[in-house]
Each structure stands twice: as structure tokens, then as C-alpha cells.
């Protein structure tokens, strides 16, 4: 057979659909790969093939169109299953041919089991969501596809293991489910259940997602510097191990790049040749506001290193700020036997 | 548990058009910072019920008003005091009404399960 | 803004039937609509929430349906207590940019002959 673009195994795709469910899968192909979709192909004389690799096997094989109840079609550039059974798990490959043209990729399909509160193995997208901002909401998610516009589905909303219908300041609108206020109480795993009949035959499609509450934008600050502050002066001998602490708060953004470095007279401690380490520890509170601490050591300082400055940085999408450490060189004790002598013979 | 109503006076709240009011909701038996929302529903004389608008009771002032309200209205809370406070501003005669206070459990948007007895509001020169 | 309508208004039954108030929607409210009890001189009393479920002490007798933008109230049994105006209230959280929008219907009178 001639030469055809493989595209391997596309592992970042790794698709999880629940047992006894429809499911319908594009072909990635379109998506991530090639520069034309399917309706180009088609009219351009190119065919789209499928097959499979079982789970735990190494040959490749046709899918069986022929199934009863057509369980398993193709539709223009989507495998369908109606519905998904355990051993439908395995590596699919579609691939785009005709004679002198062929480009392939494989892509690992996985059917799980969820028990009766929806809990499985399911990799779950998180939406968060702002913290006492106001009516905010979330949709079910990839349900598009699956059945027509004329046809009205029926939606059930769950928390964990409960339907919602009149708690925790959430109200269930059809594919949308909307906060009334978030709060932390609303953390946790939110399943929308929707059913609809098709030929005969009712679906039901389950959407499971974790919802996180977040920090609210309208509260949101600069990043603040708690240390190094006024308050602390970090004294030292030379040969001493000079230990400097800077820790900063982030408000919780969005997309928010938070960072914080050091500077030794003005220059990123790797630009200068004192023996400087620089380790970082990162806290979260339960609203996701951050707090980094990066810790400078010196291990033996010298008088040089103590009469440097020492800027501990920080900056957020909110703004920059800077914060010097108070160092300096401890005046070494005064030495009262001598002195005691010297004024006693004075006298 | 109830909720009990006060402002304008014992018999209610004569106002001249223009005019302010506030008027409040004390919770007995339970708490405000049990998360509840406080709301509030208007009754003209002889009509029928009218939503004004709720607020959160607990630690944050999220509030959400009826679209015709049109900003003359504010609502308040004190967890301290267990009350919740309408404050009525630029009345009109068309303002003229039985004014209660409801409490939305679990923050459904329309489960009042529980009421107060009322306060009528005439707004006449 | 939503708009709740009520049919029909009065309605008359008498002890021991059946009564049936309609209340329609002006959007898709799905199941958040409750219905209200109200005697004179008193505040409103619950008695259904999400569209079907009775309020706790509220007599079986009283049963709601309905979800979307059509609703139904079902009194059976009809008792002379149960002479009142019953409102509903529906809620939604899309049309506004306020973004929540309560709606009562305009009542239905309830006489028991």
C-alpha cells in the first residue's frame, strides 16, 4: 500500500464517554491536523475510513457498521454510538484517503462506568466561578450534535448525588444552571442528565463538572507584600547564614500570571557571582488567592554581601510592587572587661 | 419562627408624594446568617402580589431588584439585629401598598416559605 | 420583564370537587414556579415549589404541574377553607440584566359554594 501521513496516536485526546450513552467523535483529523474540513475532502474525491484496535489487542480491524440498531455509524465526519458498550474501549484511527493521497491518526477511546451519584474514573472539566459576584451560570456541556433543534430534551440538574430544585442558591434553567450567589458551600461536582427520545429509543447524555469558587474580581488588590517589611531587620556576622524571607499575596485572577524575584543591587541573582539560592514555596486559600514565598540564603555571608540591597519583586495582572529587606552588619558586643579596667585605672 | 414587621407606625406609613420610608423585618427563631434571603412583595389595594426585590442575608449584600423599581428602592441588612431593611424613596400615590417581607429558603428565587404580617404604606398629600 | 398570566378568575366549584387554575409563562421558566395560598387580610402561603412539589403541612389535596411556560394548580376535594386567592409566582434569571426576575400571576378567586 502507498506511503500515508500517520499521524500516530494523539494521546492529548484522550476521549472518556460513559457506558450505556450515546457518543458521537469527530474525527481529529479536521480539527488539529489538517488544513481543510471534511465538506473539502469529500468534494475533493477523498474518502474517510475507520477501524479499530481493541483494548489489550494489537490488530487492527474494521468497525462493524452492521450492528443492530445501527449502535455503530458514521456520519460525514462522525463515529456515532447509540450507545456506547464497555468493550467498545480502544485505539480508533480514521483516515482520509484515495489513490494518491492518505492521512491517518489514531486516537484512544475509553467507555467508563459511573455509579448511581455519577462518580467515575471521568476526567471532569472545572468552571469556577467569582465568589458573591452576582447571577452567574453553567452550561452543560457537549450535548450540541446529539439530537435536533425540534426535539425539547429534559434536563436534570444535580450536586453530587442530589437534584437540584430548591437549594444552595442555585436555580436549574434547561441546559443552563445559575447561581443566584456563589459561595464556597457551592464547591463540588454539578451533573446535568439530559434525556431525549430519538427513533423509538430515549437517550440520556451525562455531563459532570466541578465547580471551584473562586476570588471575586470586584475584590481583587495589587499583589501585597507581608515580608521583607520595616518591621524586621536581618542582622548578621560575617561567616553567618543569611536567611531572607519574601512572602506575597495574590488576589485570586483569572488568568493572572503571578510572580515574585529578587534582585541584589538591582540585578536577578543569577547575573551575579555570590553564592545565592532561592527557593520558592506556593500556598492556595480556599478561594484560590495565592500566596509565594521565595526564601534567599546566603550560606556565609560577607561584609560585602551585608552591605548590598536586597529588593524582593512581585507582580500580577493587578499591578507591580517592590519591598527592600533591612540588612546590615551586626556591631560586634562591646567588651566591658576592658573596658571595667581601663576605668578603674583612671581613678 | 417569623418574621416581624415594623416602620411607619403601628397603623402604617402616611407619606407625602416625594416622600421617604424605611421599613424593616426582624427574624425571630432562626438566624440571617443561616444564608437565607430576605425579600420583599408589595400588594396594592384590592390587587394583586408584586415582587420588589431580595437581598442576601448573609455576609455579603448581593442584591437583585423588580426592573421597575428603577433605583428608588434599597435594600439592607443587619445580621447583628437580625433585620432586613426596605428603604422606600421619590414615593408616588402609585406606591400605595401592603408591604411584606418573605423569606426565600435555600435561595430558590421563589420558595417564601415564611412571612411577615404586613405593613401598609399610603402615599396621599 | 417576565409576565405571568392567570385564567381564570373567578372560579367556583363546590365542596368535594375539583378546581383547576392555569398559569402561563411569557418564557421558558422550566420547573421554578411556585403557587401561593392568600385569605384576606393575610400575607400569601406556600404550598407548591418547582412547579410540583408540596410545601411541608400543605394539605395532598392541592397538587401542581406543568413546566416550561404552562402550569396547572389542582385543588380536589374542594374544602370551604380552601376559599382564597391562589397566586402563582415564576422566576427567571435570563431576561433581565439584572438578572433575576421574579413574576406572581394576577390571582384567581377561589369561591366554594
Known amino acids: 500500500s502507498e506511503r500515508c501521513d500517520d499521524w500516530g496516536l494523539d494521546t492529548m485526546r484522550q476521549i472518556q464517554v460513559f457506558e450505556d450513552e450515546p457518543a458521537r467523535i469527530k474525527c481529529p483529523l479536521f480539527e488539529h491536523f489538517l488544513k481543510f474540513n471534511y465538506s473539502t475532502a469529500h468534494s475533493a474525491g477523498l474518502t474517510l475510513i475507520w477501524y479499530w484496535t481493541r483494548q489489550d489487542r494489537d490488530l487492527e480491524e474494521p468497525i462493524n457498521f452492521r450492528l443492530p440498531e445501527n449502535r455503530i455509524s458514521k456520519e460525514k465526519d462522525v463515529l456515532w454510538f447509540r450507545p456506547t458498550l464497555l468493550n467498545d474501549t480502544g485505539n480508533y484511527t480514521c483516515m482520509l484517503r484515495n489513490t494518491t493521497y492518505c492521512s491517518k491518526v489514531a486516537f484512544p477511546l475509553e467507555v467508563v462506568q459511573k455509579d448511581s451519584c455519577f462518580n467515575s474514573p471521568m476526567k471532569l472539566p472545572v468552571h469556577k466561578l467569582y465568589i458573591e459576584y452576582g447571577i452567574q451560570r453553567i452550561t452543560c456541556p457537549n450535548v450540541d450534535g446529539y439530537f435536533p433543534s425540534s426535539v425539547k430534551p429534559t434536563i436534570t440538574w444535580y450536586m453530587g448525588c442530589y437534584k437540584i430544585q430548591n437549594f444552595n442558591n442555585v436555580i436549574p434553567e434547561g441546559m443552563n444552571l445559575s447561581f443566584l450567589i456563589a459561595l464556597i458551600s457551592n464547591n463540588g461536582n454539578y451533573t446535568c442528565v439530559v434525556t431525549y427520545p430519538e427513533n423509538g429509543r430515549t437517550f440520556h447524555l451525562t455531563r459532570t463538572l466541578t465547580v471551584k469558587v473562586v476570588g471575586s474580581p470586584k475584590n481583587a488588590v495589587p499583589p501585597v507584600i507581608h515580608s521583607p517589611n520595616d518591621h524586621v531587620v536581618y542582622e548578621k556576622e560575617p561567616g553567618e547564614e543569611l536567611l531572607i524571607p519574601c512572602t506575597v499575596y495574590f488576589s485570586f485572577l483569572m488568568d493572572s500570571r503571578n510572580e515574585v524575584w529578587w534582585t541584589i543591587d538591582g540585578k536577578k541573582p543569577d547575573d551575579i557571582t555570590i553564592d545565592v539560592t532561592i527557593n520558592e514555596s506556593i500556598s492556595h486559600s480556599r478561594t484560590e488567592d495565592e500566596t509565594r514565598t521565595q526564601i534567599l540564603s546566603i550560606k556565609k555571608v560577607t561584609s560585602e554581601d551585608l552591605k548590598r540591597s536586597y529588593v524582593c519583586h512581585a507582580r500580577s495582572a493587578k499591578g507591580e510592587v517592590a519591598k527592600a529587606a533591612k540588612v546590615k552588619q551586626k556591631v560586634p558586643a562591646p567588651r566591658y572587661t576592658v573596658e571595667l579596667a581601663c576605668g578603674f585605672g583612671a581613678t | 419562627q417569623q418574621l416581624e414587621q415594623s416602620g411607619g407606625g403601628a397603623e402604617g406609613g402616611l407619606v407625602k408624594p416625594g416622600g421617604s420610608l424605611e421599613l424593616c423585618c426582624k427574624a425571630?427563631?432562626?438566624?440571617?446568617?443561616?444564608?437565607?434571603?430576605i425579600c420583599w412583595v408589595r400588594q396594592a389595594p384590592g390587587k394583586g402580589l408584586e415582587w420588589v426585590g431580595c437581598i442576601y442575608a448573609d455576609s455579603s449584600s448581593i442584591t437583585y431588584y423588580a426592573s421597575w423599581v428603577n433605583g428608588r428602592f434599597t435594600l439592607s441588612r443587619d445580621i447583628d439585629q437580625s433585620t432586613g431593611c426596605l428603604q422606600l424613596n421619590s414615593l408616588t400615590a402609585a406606591d400605595t401598598a401592603m408591604y411584606y417581607c418573605a423569606r426565600d429558603y435555600g435561595g430558590s428565587g421563589y420558595n417564601f416559605n415564611l412571612w411577615g404580617q404586613g405593613t401598609l404604606v399610603t402615599v396621599s398629600s | 420583564a417576565l409576565v405571568m398570566t392567570q385564567t381564570p378568575s373567578p372560579v367556583s366549584a363546590a365542596v368535594g370537587g375539583t378546581v383547576t387554575i392555569s398559569c402561563q409563562a411569557s418564557e421558558d421558566i422550566y420547573s421554578n414556579l411556585a403557587w401561593y395560598q392568600q385569605k384576606r387580610g393575610q400575607p400569601p402561603k406556600l404550598l407548591i415549589y418547582?412547579?410540583?412539589t408540596l410545601a411541608s403541612g400543605v394539605p395532598s389535596r392541592f397538587s401542581g404541574s406543568g413546566s416550561g411556560t404552562e402550569f396547572t394548580l389542582t385543588i380536589s376535594g374542594l374544602q370551604s377553607d380552601d376559599a382564597a386567592t391562589y397566586y402563582c409566582?415564576?422566576?427567571?434569571?435570563?431576561?433581565?440584566?439584572?438578572?433575576?426576575?421574579?413574576?406572581f400571576g394576577g390571582g384567581t378567586e377561589v369561591v366554594v359554594k
Open positions: 409566582l415564576g422566576v427567571c434569571t435570563y431576561i433581565n440584566a439584572n438578572g433575576w426576575d421574579n413574576a
Open positions: 425571630s427563631g432562626f438566624s440571617l446568617s443561616s444564608a437565607y434571603w
Open positions: 418547582y412547579a410540583s
